[in-house]
C-alpha cells in the first residue's frame, strides 16, 4: 500500500519514461536532406515527454536504450510515380554530437510509397537524431502517414 | 528486499501494463470496411491483458500513451495481383466515441502484399480502435501474417 | 526518497527489462535458411541484456510477453532485381524446443528490397528464435539495414 502511494507520488521522469511522437513540419532547403519535425498537443496527437526539439531535430535528454520508430509516406505517389523518379531513401541517425554520428536505420522506397520501421538502439543525453530523405518526391505531412518517435526502454 | 517483495505482490494492472495482440477473425459485411479481430490463448498466441474486444474491435481500458502496431498481409497476392486491383489501403483509427474519431495510422499496399507499421499515440479509456481495409483483395488470416496489437507505454 | 534509492539499487534484471538488438553475422550453409546473428558493444550498437546467443540464434532467458522486431534488407537489390528472382520470404519463429515450434512473423519481399515488422508474443525461458530467409538474394550486413531484436514488455 505504502509502495503504491509512493510510486504514484514519484514524478514520471524519475522512472525514465521519456517518450516522443512527432509529425512532419517541413522539408529542408535545397541542399539540406533533413526532415524538420514538430510536436505538441496543440498540433494534434504528437507530444514530447522528456526529449526536446532543436530546430526541428529530436534531442535526447536521458541515457538509455530507446525504441526508435518512423513512418514516411510520399505525397501524391503511386508505384508508377515512384519508379519514374530517382530512388528515395530515408535514413535515421545520430547527427550530433559529430563524434557520435552514425546511421541507425535506413530504408529505400523502391516502387513503394511508404516506409515504416523501428529498432532498439542506445542513445545518450545530448544525442540529436536526424532523418534524412534523399530523392525528388515530397513527403506527406498527413499526421497518420508520416511520423517519427522514440520510447525509452531501459537504462 | 522489502521493496522487491512489495513489487511482486502488486497486481500488474496497477502498473498499467495493458497489452493486447489480436489475430484476424473475419472481414466485415459488404459495406463495412472494418476488420474483425479475436484474441485469447485458446486461439494461439493472441491475448488481451487489460483491453477488451467489443464486437471484434479493440476497446481501451486505461488512459495513457500506447504503442499501436499492425501487420496485414493480403491473401493469394503477388505484386502483379496487387497492381491489378483497386488500391488497397489500411487505416487504424479511433472510431468511437465519435467525438474522438481520428485516423492514427494509414498505409497503402501499392505493389506490395504486406503492410506493417507502428506508432505511439495517446489513448483514453473507452476509445475503440478500428482497422479499415479498403480494396478488393482479401486479408490473410494466418496468425503470423496478419495481427494487430497495442502496448501501454506510460501515463 | 527511500523508494527512489531502493529502486536505483535493484538490479535491472529483477525488473524484467530483458532486451536485445542484433546485427547480421552471416547466412547459413546451403540447406540452412537461418540467418545467424551477433551482438555486443564491440560490434557497434548491438547488445544483449538478458537473452543470449546460441550458435547465432537468440535464446530467451525470462518468461514474458515480448515485442519482437526485425528489418532485413536485400543486398544489391532493386525492384527489378527483386521481381526477377525467386520470391524471397522471411519468417521469424520459435525453432526450439521443438514442442513449441511455431512461426511468429512472416513477410515476403515481393518487388521490394526491405521488410520490417514487429509483433507482441509470449515467449518462455529457453525458447530459441530463428529467422529463416528463403530466396536467392543475399541479405545486407549493414547494421542500419538488417537487424533483429526483442524487448521484454510484461510478465
Amino acid at each position: 500500500q505504502r509502495f503504491a502511494q509512493a510510486q504514484q507520488q514519484l514524478p514520471l521522469e524519475s522512472l525514465g519514461w521519456d517518450v516522443a511522437e512527432l509529425q512532419l513540419n517541413h522539408t529542408g532547403p535545397q541542399q539540406d536532406p533533413r526532415l524538420y519535425w514538430q510536436g505538441g498537443p496543440a498540433l494534434g496527437r504528437s507530444f514530447l515527454h522528456g526529449p526536446e526539439l532543436d530546430k526541428g531535430q529530436l534531442r535526447i535528454h536521458r541515457d538509455g536504450i530507446y525504441m526508435v520508430h518512423i513512418q514516411v509516406t510520399l505525397a501524391i505517389c503511386s508505384s508508377t510515380t515512384a519508379s519514374r523518379h530517382h530512388p528515395t531513401t530515408l535514413a535515421v541517425g545520430i547527427c550530433s554530437p559529430a563524434s557520435r554520428s552514425i546511421s541507425l536505420l535506413r530504408l529505400s522506397f523502391h516502387q513503394g510509397c511508404t516506409i515504416a520501421s523501428q529498432r532498439l538502439t542506445p542513445l545518450a543525453r545530448g544525442d540529436t537524431l536526424c532523418t534524412n530523405l534523399t530523392g525528388t518526391l515530397l513527403p506527406s505531412r498527413n499526421t497518420d502517414e508520416t511520423f517519427f518517435g522514440v520510447q525509452w526502454v531501459r537504462p | 528486499q522489502r521493496f522487491a517483495q512489495a513489487q511482486q505482490q502488486l497486481p500488474l494492472e496497477s502498473l498499467g501494463w495493458d497489452v493486447a495482440e489480436l489475430q484476424l477473425n473475419h472481414t466485415g459485411p459488404q459495406q463495412d470496411p472494418r476488420l474483425y479481430w479475436q484474441g485469447g490463448p485458446a486461439l494461439g498466441r493472441s491475448f488481451l491483458h487489460g483491453p477488451e474486444l467489443d464486437k471484434g474491435q479493440l476497446r481501451i481500458h486505461r488512459d495513457g500513451i500506447y504503442m499501436v502496431h499492425i501487420q496485414v498481409t493480403l491473401a493469394i497476392c503477388s505484386s502483379t495481383t496487387a497492381s491489378r486491383h483497386h488500391p488497397t489501403t489500411l487505416a487504424v483509427g479511433i472510431c468511437s466515441p465519435a467525438s474522438r474519431s481520428i485516423s492514427l495510422l494509414r498505409l497503402s499496399f501499392h505493389q506490395g502484399c504486406t503492410i506493417a507499421s507502428q506508432r505511439l499515440t495517446p489513448l483514453a479509456r473507452g476509445d475503440t480502435l478500428c482497422t479499415n481495409l479498403t480494396g478488393t483483395l482479401l486479408p490473410s488470416r494466418n496468425t503470423d501474417e496478419t495481427f494487430f496489437g497495442v502496448q501501454w507505454v506510460r501515463p | 526518497q527511500r523508494f527512489a534509492q531502493a529502486q536505483q539499487q535493484l538490479p535491472l534484471e529483477s525488473l524484467g527489462w530483458d532486451v536485445a538488438e542484433l546485427q547480421l553475422n552471416h547466412t547459413g550453409p546451403q540447406q540452412d535458411p537461418r540467418l545467424y546473428w551477433q551482438g555486443g558493444p564491440a560490434l557497434g550498437r548491438s547488445f544483449l541484456h538478458g537473452p543470449e546467443l546460441d550458435k547465432g540464434q537468440l535464446r530467451i532467458h525470462r518468461d514474458g510477453i515480448y515485442m519482437v522486431h526485425i528489418q532485413v534488407t536485400l543486398a544489391i537489390c532493386s525492384s527489378t532485381t527483386a521481381s526477377r528472382h525467386h520470391p524471397t520470404t522471411l519468417a521469424v519463429g520459435i525453432c526450439s524446443p521443438a514442442s513449441r515450434s511455431i512461426s511468429l512473423l512472416r513477410l515476403s519481399f515481393h518487388q521490394g528490397c526491405t521488410i520490417a515488422s514487429q509483433r507482441l508474443t509470449p515467449l518462455a525461458r529457453g525458447d530459441t528464435l530463428c529467422t529463416n530467409l528463403t530466396g536467392t538474394l543475399l541479405p545486407s550486413r549493414n547494421t542500419d539495414e538488417t537487424f533483429f531484436g526483442v524487448q521484454w514488455v510484461r510478465p
Epitope: T27, H86, T136, L137, S140 | - | -
Partner: antibody, heavy 119, light 111 residues
Framework: EVQLVQSGAEVKKPGASVKVSCKAS????????IHWVRQAPGQGLEWMGD????????SYNQKFRDRVTMTRDTSTSTVYMELSSLRSEDTAVYYC????????????WGQGTLVTVSS | DIVMTQSPDSLAVSLGERATINCRAS??????????MHWYQQKPGQPPKLLIY???NLESGVPDRFSGSGSGTDFTLTISSLQAEDVAVYYC?????????FGGGTKVEIK
C-alpha cells in the same frame, strides 16, 4: 550552376517531325526529371510531359500521347523531345524545365526553342 | 484534367500599390498537407521564372514583396508594392496530378 541549353529554332512543314534537344549541366543528370512545356505565340503555357533520365521512363500529357516521344542520352546528359505529325497549331516555343529539389514546380528553364510549322 | 482559371486577365496598378491576382482550380489541389499551387512571372522573350511554390513558399532570390496564399481551390498571388520591374505576365500552375496545367495568365501593367 544548373543549366539547361536547348537546340536552335526549327522551321518544319505540316506532317513532318521535329526533335528538340535539351543539354543539362551543373548537376547529376540522372537524378532529376526533365519536363517539357510549350507556349504558342501570345498564348499560355502547356505541360507536355516529362522523362526520368535514370531509366528513360516518360509520362505524357494525353493530348500529345500519340505524337510525342521523350528520350535521353546519359552519355551527353541530353534529353530529347520529338513531336511528329506537325500541324500549324504546333507553332510554339518549346521549353525544357527542371524542378529544384522536389518534383512539381519548375525552378530551372531552358532558353526555349521556337518551332515554326508552315507550308 | 484540372482547369485553372486566372483573374483578372490584365491588371493596371500604380507604382508602390498592391496588386492581387487570383487563381481558381476546378477541383481541390490540396492534399497530403500541401497545396500544390505555384506561381511564375514571365517577361517578353524569356522563360517563366518561379516565384512561389506550394501556395505560400517564396522561391530563393525572389523579393519578399511577392507572397502567395490560399488552399483547396482558391489561391492568390500578391505583390505588396508594385515596382517597375514587376511588369510581366503571371501564371499559376498546379501539380496535384498529371497532367499539370497552367492558368491563362494575368498581364500586370503600370497605371
Amino acid at each position: 550552376e544548373v543549366q539547361l541549353v536547348q537546340s536552335g529554332a526549327e522551321v518544319k512543314k505540316p506532317g513532318a517531325s521535329v526533335k528538340v534537344s535539351c543539354k543539362a549541366s551543373g548537376y547529376t543528370f540522372t537524378t532529376y526529371n526533365i519536363h517539357w512545356v510549350r507556349q504558342a505565340p501570345g498564348q499560355g503555357l502547356e505541360w507536355m510531359g516529362d522523362i526520368y533520365p535514370g531509366n528513360g521512363d516518360a509520362s505524357y500529357n494525353q493530348k500529345f500521347r500519340d505524337r510525342v516521344t521523350m528520350t535521353r542520352d546519359t552519355s551527353t546528359s541530353t534529353v530529347y523531345m520529338e513531336l511528329s505529325s506537325l500541324r500549324s497549331e504546333d507553332t510554339a516555343v518549346y521549353y525544357c524545365a527542371r524542378f529544384s529539389r522536389f518534383d512539381g514546380w519548375f525552378a530551372y528553364w531552358g532558353q526555349g526553342t521556337l518551332v515554326t510549322v508552315s507550308s | 484534367d484540372i482547369v485553372m482559371t486566372q483573374s483578372p486577365d490584365s491588371l493596371a496598378v500604380s507604382l508602390g500599390e498592391r496588386a492581387t491576382i487570383n487563381c481558381r482550380a476546378s477541383r481541390s489541389v490540396s492534399t497530403s498537407g500541401y497545396s500544390y499551387m505555384h506561381w511564375y512571372q514571365q517577361k517578353p522573350g524569356q522563360p517563366p521564372k518561379l516565384l512561389i511554390y506550394l501556395a505560400d513558399n517564396l522561391e530563393s532570390g525572389v523579393p519578399d514583396r511577392f507572397s502567395g496564399s490560399g488552399s483547396g481551390t482558391d489561391f492568390t498571388l500578391t505583390i505588396s508594392s508594385l515596382q517597375a520591374e514587376d511588369v510581366a505576365v503571371y501564371y499559376c500552375q498546379h501539380s496535384r496530378e498529371l497532367p499539370y496545367t497552367f492558368g491563362g495568365g494575368t498581364k500586370v501593367e503600370i497605371k
